[in-house]
Structures are given as C-alpha cells and as structure tokens.
C-alpha cells in the first residue's frame, strides 16, 4: 500500500511527507499519518529549543514531546516541562541548560496523544547543533601606524570551541573581504589606508573541536575605523543583512 | 515513487561478515534520512542503524561496533556492512527511506518511513 500525490515542486517529497503514508511490507502496521519532524537548536548551551510544525497537522492537535539521553542512569523519556505554543497549539519544547548534554545521544520522541500510535522518534547530535551568541564588544586597536587589530569576545563558550568568520570592507568596496579565524578572538589587518573608512562584524560557529555545527551566529554589531571625512556612496556603504 | 531493493543477504556462519546494499531508483537519497531495519520471526521489526542526510548516524546497542552504514548518493545506494556475525543476528533486514527538510533528522521509529524495500534474508548459523 502507497499514496500518491501529483505535485509540481522541486521540493514535492519534503511538501508530500506531510500527506502520505509509508510505503511498508504488508505485513508492518497500517498506515498512519507522518508527524511533522522535529528540529532541535541549542543556543549558546544556555538553553535548547526543539520545534515542529503544527500547522502541518490536518486538525489543530497537542503534540507531545517527550526526550532521554541514550546512556543515562533514568532511561525513561521524560515529557516536556516547558512547551512553546502557536497559536494555542503546542509547537515546541523548551530544554533548560541542566538538562542539556552535548555529548549524549539525544533521543526525542513526538507523540499524538489521541493517536498512542502515532509517533516518531529521533536522535540527535547536539554538538553539532549548538549556534553561539553573536560576537560582542567588537574592539579596534593599531598595532602600527597601518596594522589594525579587531578583537571581540563571546559569551558561555569555550573560545577554543569556536571558528569566527570575519567580514570588513571598505567604503570604496562593493563586496566584503571574509575570513575564517580558529578559536582566537582576534584578527589583524596588515594593510589599511586612512583615507578610507572601514566596516567589520564577525559571527561564529561551534565548529570544528567540540562539536561540527554549521549554523553560524548572528552577525556581531559592526564596528567602524577610519576617517570620517572621506565622502561616502551610500549605497555602497549599505550593511547586507 | 521511490522504490528501494536490497540484495546482500544470505546464509553465512558465525563470525563472518555480509554487506547488505539497497539502491534506490525514482530520486535521488541525498535528502533522505536511511535505515537499515530488522525483523526475526515472531519478533518486533527494530533499527539497526539508521541515518540523517547531514551524516550522522546511530546503531543499536546490540550492533554497535559490529556493523556500519555508509552511504553513495553519486550511486544513490546505502550499504550496511555486518561483521562479527552473530547467531541472533539472523532476520529479514529491510531498508527505508524518508524524505526530510533537516539535515540532522535520523528517525529511529519505522512508521516515520514512507518508503521501504522487500527485504533481504540474513541467516547466520552457528
């Protein structure tokens, strides 16, 4: 038994998987509707967020969330304590810092509570997931009369955990120069003309030592060097988002 | 339609080693959470190991160490290496396939599988 559903997007299967049963050897469970997937961020190691979307469901239903850690002394899943609504239906689970461990196999299971059946169970990786704080207190200083160095800091992690990807151009620059910089808050430019005014922001990751997320920060405040005389093309000089 | 088809099994004694493969035609795995599914007579149907298209993969307790997946989205295949074969070993291994928008998501529950192949035995004698 299958279900079929002519649809003309690029992404049909991903749009169809809301909509068709599985495809299963006879002999395995009748056909239930799929769950929407769960996708699980841990921000900052301050806290995580596990998500879904509930207007993926046919009629508005409370969903459950419930979560263990593969090796762990209670190996019973534990609900949600802290849910995150849509409107007024459940969409997500708040997970508090002391119930977060990066380095367990994370295993979450979401349940319809009229459908005991109906459920799907993940694991995750939460190292790979974490997305830090963006960058603060972005900081210019010369090294010499044409070096200057930018330094920032970050907040709860460990530097040594973070790769940072430095952006700066010019106001004669239609484009920005980028850089990745490992575990050091810090970066220096050998070369800068002090006719022309710079602009520098930096956003990081929890990659590669301790974990190998891809989601990078929020871009830091950008921060500003050089002369303010120069006459500057606006549209040039416009930060993209 | 994906259609999934293993091939691989077979009897082997204990001890050994089997490779089960399952290609895929109708579109391609690159998005797709994989696993690799068993099912003994009389038993319930459980993971073996299973995979999310960003490539993180788990196993069960019980293969841990013994067995490995890999993936060839170029050959739109997955394959489930088995060594160190063992008598309890022996079931029905299915693959299946779900189509997913995270790259971090590996279903370890079967019904979150829409797409499943026919099944390949394993018969592992001691």
């Known amino acids: 038994w299958s279900s079929k559903v002519l649809m003309s997007s690029a992404n049909e299967d991903i749009k169809a998987d809301l909509i068709l049963t599985s495809t299963a050897p006879e002999h395995l469970s009748a056909p239930t509707l799929p769950l929407p997937e769960v996708q699980c961020f841990v921000f900052n190691i301050e806290y995580m967020n596990c998500t879904w979307n509930s207007s993926s469901e046919p009629q508005a239903t409370n969903l459950t969330l419930h979560y263990r850690y593969k090796v762990s002394d209670n190996n019973t899943f534990q609900e949600c304590s802290h849910y995150l609504f849509s409107k007024e239906i459940t969409s997500g689970c708040q997970i508090q810092k002391e119930d977060i461990q990066l380095y367990q196999t994370f295993v979450v299971q979401l349940q319809d509570p009229q459908k005991p059946q109906r459920r799907a169970v993940q694991k995750l990786n939460l190292q790979n997931l974490v997305i830090p704080r963006a960058p603060e207190n972005l900081t210019l200083s010369n090294l010499s009369e044409s070096q200057l160095e930018l330094r920032w800091k970050s907040r709860h992690i460990k530097e040594r955990c973070l790769q940072y990807l430095v952006q700066y151009r010019s106001n004669r620059d239609r484009s920005w120069t980028e850089l990745i910089v490992n575990h050091e808050p810090r970066f220096s430019l050998p070369s800068v003309d002090e006719l022309k005014r710079y602009t520098f922001r930096v956003r990081s990751r929890y990659n590669p030592i301790c974990g190998s997320s891809q989601q990078w920060s929020k871009w830091s405040q950008p921060v500003h060097w050089g002369s303010h005389t120069v006459e500057e093309n606006p549209s040039l000089f416009a930060l993209e988002a | 339609e994906v259609q999934l088809v293993e091939s691989g099994g077979g009897l082997v004694q204990a001890g050994g080693s089997l490779r089960l493969s399952c290609a895929a035609s109708g579109r391609t795995l690159s998005r797709y959470a994989m696993g690799w599914f068993r099912q003994a007579p009389g038993k319930e149907r459980e993971y073996v190991a299973i995979?999310?298209?960003?490539?993180?993969?788990f196993y069960a307790d019980s293969v841990e160490g013994r067995f490995t997946f890999s993936r060839d989205n170029a050959k739109n295949e997955v394959y489930l290496q088995m060594n160190s074969l063992q008598p309890e070993d022996t079931a029905v291994y299915y693959c299946?396939?779900?189509?997913?928008?995270?790259?971090?998501?590996?279903?370890?529950?079967?019904?979150?599988?829409?797409?499943w192949g026919q099944g390949t035995q394993v018969t592992v004698s001691s």
């Open positions: 299946a396939g779900a189509p997913t928008s995270f790259a971090t998501t590996a279903y370890s529950s079967s019904n979150s599988y829409r797409y």
């Open positions: 995979d999310s298209w960003g490539g993180d993969t």
